[in-house]
């Protein structure tokens, strides 16, 4: 049928709850393409009635949720104006209960299921959560244990857990759960994490840069909505945190009963040597007391602000 | 059951470059430290370097200029080389990787070593 | 760099003894991690993070220290117990091992 195949390394995942997959490959998926998902070399397409439990959902394929029998190779077909590229992911799902004691029952997990804190640091666990625009995803709550996390060592940042002064007794099992909706209906997404903790410094303890912003104002009018975006390369070991902050506080606990401005959810490019993080910032409604006041964007030891200024009058 | 296995020549000629391969199983190398580690006879152990799971390679200031550390994840492979070898790089090689107990640091599982002699 | 320096370098005991090994560092390390070899083996992880045991490793070892200080003590030492073992530190780079401290029997 003229199409390449692709190969894509296996995905290990747990039944009962939901699970998504973006069929995206760049530089393929990045013109006009058409994408169809497709079961174990299946010639009729996966559906995309959305009340299906299995769907796709523009170049996604939904469980909701996912259950034993859907282990299998699924097939996404990329098709360009002169091209066409099938892909292949190999899902397995198997039968965990997170708060099992035997934890030897655990198959290899996909890496981002491991995560490493490093010791004496300020570091982050994330929690992964990728599904479709159709899909909401309530707070995340965290687990360590089967315990909620709670103390003041540890911060809820949007998909991320803070936690500072990394120490040996935070090595073990953590689960990070959200609550999804989609259509009207509420499904519980619960991602277990190995976590362990090493001394390395990892990433040789390279300085962060701040591409913008640069230290600058910017005109905005009273009551507008603005975003901005802080955009940090770094090297692709790091262990440092990026936020914005305001009088040495987070963004979202500054404004925590307001939520006029708010930290956005954080996003990766991965380049060969290094990664290109963007976090923004959204003041939802600029108010006058936000004229004037530095904007810092942090990452690691490195940081960067905005102010907000009012633009000059026009006398014309 | 992570398990270890170094492979290479047991015998490589002085200025010439000493390649090793450590091929693991039960475990993935795109997750922890993966290490090497040599012992010279009748010595004490030295610290190479690492590869880790991103692909970072961090290597000891005192090989730095002749080693390089790589892996192919697609294999489950990752590799050793020293160049301009002298008869002091005559030892015993080691690969290990830690993760025991949740500690990445704690080196548990090794490979059963491999001799590599420099002589001409 | 860390220099770790461990006393003594060889040691002569019985069976039934109270053997102390003691690693010094020449800066303050966060932990330690003591290796047992035996002649023609792979060093096996014996003590990590100071204090811990490794799995398979008698609770007649023991492991204590902070900062510059580190010591592995038995309590009563038994036939399996004599080789060469090793500490190591992960705190700062480059990462480094003691010179071994060589258990013989007198």
């Known amino acids: 049928d003229g199409c390449k195949d692709i190969f894509m390394k296996n995905e290990i995942l747990s039944a009962s709850q939901p699970f998504a997959f973006n069929c995206t490959f760049p530089p393929i998926t990045s013109g006009e393409v058409s994408v169809t998902w497709y079961k174990n070399s299946s010639k009729i397409p996966v559906s995309k009635i959305i009340q299906s439990r299995i769907h796709q959902d523009e170049t996604w394929i939904l469980f909701l949720p996912m259950e034993w029998g859907d282990s299998g190779v699924y097939q996404c077909v990329i098709k360009g104006r002169d091209s066409c590229h099938r892909i292949h992911v190999n899902l397995t799902v198997f039968e965990k209960h997170w708060c099992d004691t035997s934890i030897g029952g655990l198959p290899n997990l996909s890496d981002e299921y491991k995560q490493i804190l490093h010791l004496g640091k300020d570091d982050s666990l994330t929690c992964h959560l990728h599904f479709p625009k159709s899909c909401v995803l309530g707070p995340i709550k965290w687990y360590k244990d089967c315990n909620e996390i709670k103390g003041e060592r540890f911060t809820v940042l949007e998909t991320r857990l803070l936690v500072s002064n990394v120490s040996a007794e935070d090595r073990g099992n953590y689960a990070c759960q959200a609550i999804l909706t989609h259509s009207g209906k509420q499904y519980e997404v619960l991602n277990g994490i190995t976590v362990s903790i090493t001394e390395r410094a990892g990433y040789g303890g390279s300085v962060p840069k701040i591409i913008y912003p640069k230290n600058h104002s910017i005109e905005v009018q009273l009551g507008t909505t603005l975003i901005v975006d802080c955009n940090v390369t770094d090297t692709k070991d790091n262990t440092n945190l990026r936020c914005w902050r305001v009088n040495n506080t987070l963004v979202d606990d500054y404004y925590d009963e307001s939520k006029r401005i708010r930290e956005g959810v954080e996003t990766h490019v991965s380049f060969r040597e290094h990664n290109l993080y963007t976090v923004n910032i959204t003041f939802l409604e600029v108010k006058m007391e936000d004229y004037g006041l530095p904007f810092m964007c942090h990452a690691g030891v490195s940081t960067a602000y905005i102010i907000l200024q009012l633009p000059a009058p026009d006398f014309r | 059951q992570v398990q270890l296995q170094e492979s290479g020549p047991g015998l490589v000629k002085p200025s010439q470059t000493l390649s090793l391969t450590c091929t693991v199983s039960g475990a993935s190398i795109t997750s922890g430290y993966w290490n090497w580690i040599r012992n010279h006879p009748g010595k004490g152990l030295e610290y190479i370097?690492?590869?880790?799971?991103?692909?970072?390679?961090y290597y000891n200031p005192s090989l730095k200029s002749r080693v390089t550390i790589s892996r192919d994840t697609s294999k489950n492979q990752y590799y050793l080389k020293l160049s301009s070898v002298t008869a002091a790089d005559t030892a015993v090689y080691y690969c290990a990787t830690g993760g025991y107990d949740y500690v990445e640091d704690a080196l548990y599982y090794w490979g059963q070593g491999t001799l590599v002699t420099v002589s001409s | 760099d860390i220099q770790m320096t461990q006393s003594p370098s060889s040691l002569s005991a019985s069976v039934g003894d109270r053997v102390t090994i003691t690693c010094r560092a020449s800066s303050n390390v966060r932990y330690m991690y003591w290796y047992q070899q035996k002649p023609g083996k792979a060093p096996k992880l014996w003590i990590y993070l100071t204090s811990n045991l490794a799995s398979g490793v008698p609770s007649r070892f023991s492991g204590s220290g902070s900062g510059t200080s580190y010591t592995l003590t038995i309590s009563s030492l038994q036939p399996e117990d004599f080789a060469t073992y090793y500490c190591q530190q992960f705190t700062t780079s480059p990462y480094t091992f003691g010179q071994g401290t060589k258990l013989e029997i007198k």
């Open positions: 370097g690492y590869i880790s799971y991103s692909g970072y390679t």
